[in-house]
Interface confidence: low
């Protein structure tokens, strides 16, 4: 569990010609507010799909009245962060939609009127617990600057908020096999063993032995895709084998979405999918035209010359959605295993594997040392999908190709002086010490700590280390 936090820094005219008209006037003062919608970026959803990770509305900003003749400045913003709590694991890849809304405060009949000023969208990769990420997005002539981060709620930690931390039972150390929880060094990572067989892709656990499913999956091991079409009756019994998901009375009962919008349940509430030309939490807002610049990412707006006619966005390659706000990203399906880098080349997906892995999807774990040569007599040491060379004396570097200074590590003990030699190093020992590294004290009676000194070797002689 955790919280996604969004900080809006500024909303105003973007660079370049064609500065937008101020959204407010002396006759119609207004104020801004923002809405954020988050979706996990692990599946190619329709652009209109619900905000499965959650959504949030900001407070209303200060009332603003345009100064006659002045260009539209950066507009006054609401205070505080937009916070979207998430109950399950943080997915790492997510898509967002941020909407800037105008609330007109004139003498409207029936209260203030809302209208959408701008809508930006994108897909990002973000680890929980990391620093604030900064972003700039443009919608038509408007520019939105914002920062965002995801943070875990205790006791969860980690980049996905799936590891748990618990206070230490002993003041000095964690239990066997358990690490301290950075940055909470006074706490220990809790042993977390999910139910045996729990799907690593679609399941996770917050308590040992459990298997909780990500949205869209069900069954005891989260291996069954949810399908509402397989139900015999709308309120029939649940079947884990067919993945029939049976809702009880829910937030969509009675359809809260206006103007022909369709309602979808979310883990916390509901989401309205609006027909073209309508926006808002319940599709209650209309009047968007091509003049409002509703098509993003270079989309071409057609139709919609007046508020009563719908517009259509023709999207450039690589984008989709009713407003071209969704980048087509096949790599979001994370097809590359074992940390491989996904490349979407248009005609094909390609995986670039980390060292030690191979195969079209990096699914083959190679012998780390296979085909790896360590130069100059070095030996290959396997470990963790990468290889390491243990180099012979006098050599260093990843493949033992670099000459090393054998004296750099100060190998001579007890004040002995080190000399580099073609076959290694030589230690000239200080009085009272002997041995290849001057490691043995010479006893006062002349006997050394060695079991037997090599014949002909006097204490203090340089010792060649071969």
């Amino acid at each position: 569990a955790g919280v996604f936090e969004l900080q809006i820094h500024s909303f105003g005219p973007g660079p370049g010609p064609g500065a937008p008209r101020s959204p407010c006037s002396a006759r119609l003062p207004c104020r801004l507010f923002f809405r954020v919608c988050l979706k996990p970026g692990l599946s190619e959803e329709a652009a209109e799909s619900p905000c499965a990770l959650g959504a949030a509305l900001s407070a209303r900003g200060p009332v603003y009245t345009e100064q006659p003749g002045a260009p539209a400045p950066d507009l006054p913003l609401p205070d505080g962060l937009l916070q979207v709590p998430f109950r399950d694991a943080w997915p790492g890849t997510f898509s967002f939609i941020i909407e800037t809304w105008r609330e007109e405060l004139g003498d409207q009949i029936g209260g203030p009127a809302w209208s959408l000023l701008a809508r930006v969208a994108g897909r990002r990769r973000l680890a929980a617990g990391g620093p604030w990420a900064r972003d700039i997005q443009r919608a038509g002539a408007w520019e939105l600057r914002f920062s965002y981060r995801a943070r875990c709620e205790p006791p969860a930690v980690g980049t996905a908020c799936t590891r748990l931390c618990r206070p230490r039972s002993a003041p000095s150390r964690c239990g066997p096999g358990l690490r301290p929880c950075a940055p909470l060094e006074d706490e220990c990572e809790a042993p977390l063993v999910c139910r045996a067989g729990c799907s690593p892709e679609h399941g996770f656990c917050e308590q040992p032995g459990e298997c909780r499913c990500l949205e869209g999956w069900t069954g005891p091991l989260c291996t069954v895709p949810v399908s509402t079409s397989s139900c015999l009756s709308p309120r029939g019994p649940s079947s884990a084998t067919t993945g029939c998901l049976v809702p009880g009375p829910g937030p969509c009962d009675g359809n809260p979405c206006a103007n022909g919008g369709s309602c979808s349940e979310t883990p916390r509430s509901f989401e309205c999918t609006c027909p073209r030309g309508f926006y808002g939490l319940r599709c209650e807002v209309s009047g968007v035209t091509c003049a409002d610049g509703p098509c993003f990412n270079g989309g071409l707006c057609v139709g919609g010359a007046d508020p009563d006619s719908a517009y259509i966005c023709h999207c450039p390659p690589g984008f989709q959605g009713s407003n071209c706000e969704k980048r087509v990203d096949r790599c979001s399906l994370q097809p590359c295993r074992n940390g491989g880098l996904c490349l979407d080349l248009g005609h094909a997906l390609r995986c670039r594997c980390r060292a030690g892995f191979a195969g079209p999807r990096c699914e083959h774990d190679l012998d780390d040392c296979a085909g790896r040569a360590c130069a100059n007599g070095g030996t290959c040491v396997e470990g963790g999908g990468a290889h390491r060379c243990s180099c012979a004396l006098g050599f260093g570097g990843r493949d033992c190709r670099e000459r090393a200074d054998p004296c750099a590590a100060r190998p001579c003990a007890h004040g002995g002086r080190c000399y580099a030699h073609f076959s290694g190093l030589v230690c000239a020992c200080a009085p009272g010490y002997m041995g290849a590294r001057c490691e043995f004290p010479v006893h006062p009676d002349g006997a050394s700590a060695l079991p037997a000194a090599p014949p002909g070797l006097r204490p203090g002689d340089p010792q060649r280390y071969l």
């Epitope: 880098l341 490349l343 979407d344 080349l345 248009g346 005609h347 094909a348 390609r350 670039r352 191979a358 195969g359 079209p360 083959h364 190679l366 085909g371």
Partner: antibody, heavy 116, light 107 residues
């Protein structure tokens, strides 16, 4: 260690044919796309063709379509480029490379000279 | 097809200089860009992928940046081994496309 060694280059008359080979070692050849890149004398790099791991997809630069054929034999860890109807402008050093979209390992090249 | 244009074509510099090479795409290529180094008589050497990710074993004085249509390769402190020709390459299309190259020579 990854090794790619090209062979089969030489002097050929315009309209003639050559078959280039690339012997691969040090990696699981059948798990990688492979590509041919050429470089005319004193000029820059030009991608020529590439082929999927199992040979099921092949792509060519427009200037060689219909004349060159890329193929592979995974059992022999070998990549081939059959070049027909050769022209003077095909004169170049031909490299084979492991293909990630970008090319992380290259051979030393084999020279093809098309001249009468 | 997308065209890749490098500038300058030739660059004269001294050891220790900071060197910047620019590569422009005729339309946006996101960050699907690689950089290579080639010395006379040798095969190209792969340096950078995804515009800014350094291939393992490449010295950290090399860095890449940019996205969309404008990219740069920077050598923070030019070393004698760095005098070579550098190529950028687009790789998210059906036909991978190279820039025409930038030769870095001794001043």
């Amino acid at each position: 260690e990854v090794h790619l060694v090209e062979s089969g280059g030489g002097l050929v008359q315009p309209g003639g044919s050559l078959r280039l080979s690339c012997a691969a070692s040090g990696f699981t050849f059948s798990s990688y796309w492979m590509t041919w890149v050429r470089q005319a004398p004193g000029k820059g790099l030009e991608w020529v063709a590439n082929i999927k791991e199992d040979g099921s997809e092949k792509y060519y630069v427009d200037s060689v379509k219909g004349r060159f054929t890329i193929s592979r034999d995974n059992a022999k860890n070998s990549l081939y480029l059959q070049m027909n109807s050769l022209r003077a402008e095909d004169t170049a050093l031909y490299y084979c490379a492991r293909d990630w979209g970008y090319f992380d390992y290259w051979g030393q090249g084999t020279l093809v000279t098309v001249s009468s | 097809d997308i065209q890749m244009t490098q500038s300058p074509s030739t660059l004269s510099a001294s050891v220790g200089d900071r060197v910047t090479i620019t590569c422009r795409a005729s339309q946006s290529v996101s960050d699907w860009l690689a950089w290579y180094q080639q010395k006379p008589g040798k095969a190209p050497k792969f340096l950078i992928y995804r515009a800014s990710s350094l291939e393992s074993g490449v010295p950290s004085r090399f860095s890449g940046s940019g996205s969309g249509t404008e990219f740069t390769l920077t050598i923070s402190s030019l070393q004698p081994a760095d005098f070579a020709t550098y190529y950028c390459q687009l790789y998210n299309s059906y036909s991978p496309t190279f820039g025409q190259g930038t030769k870095v020579e001794i001043k």
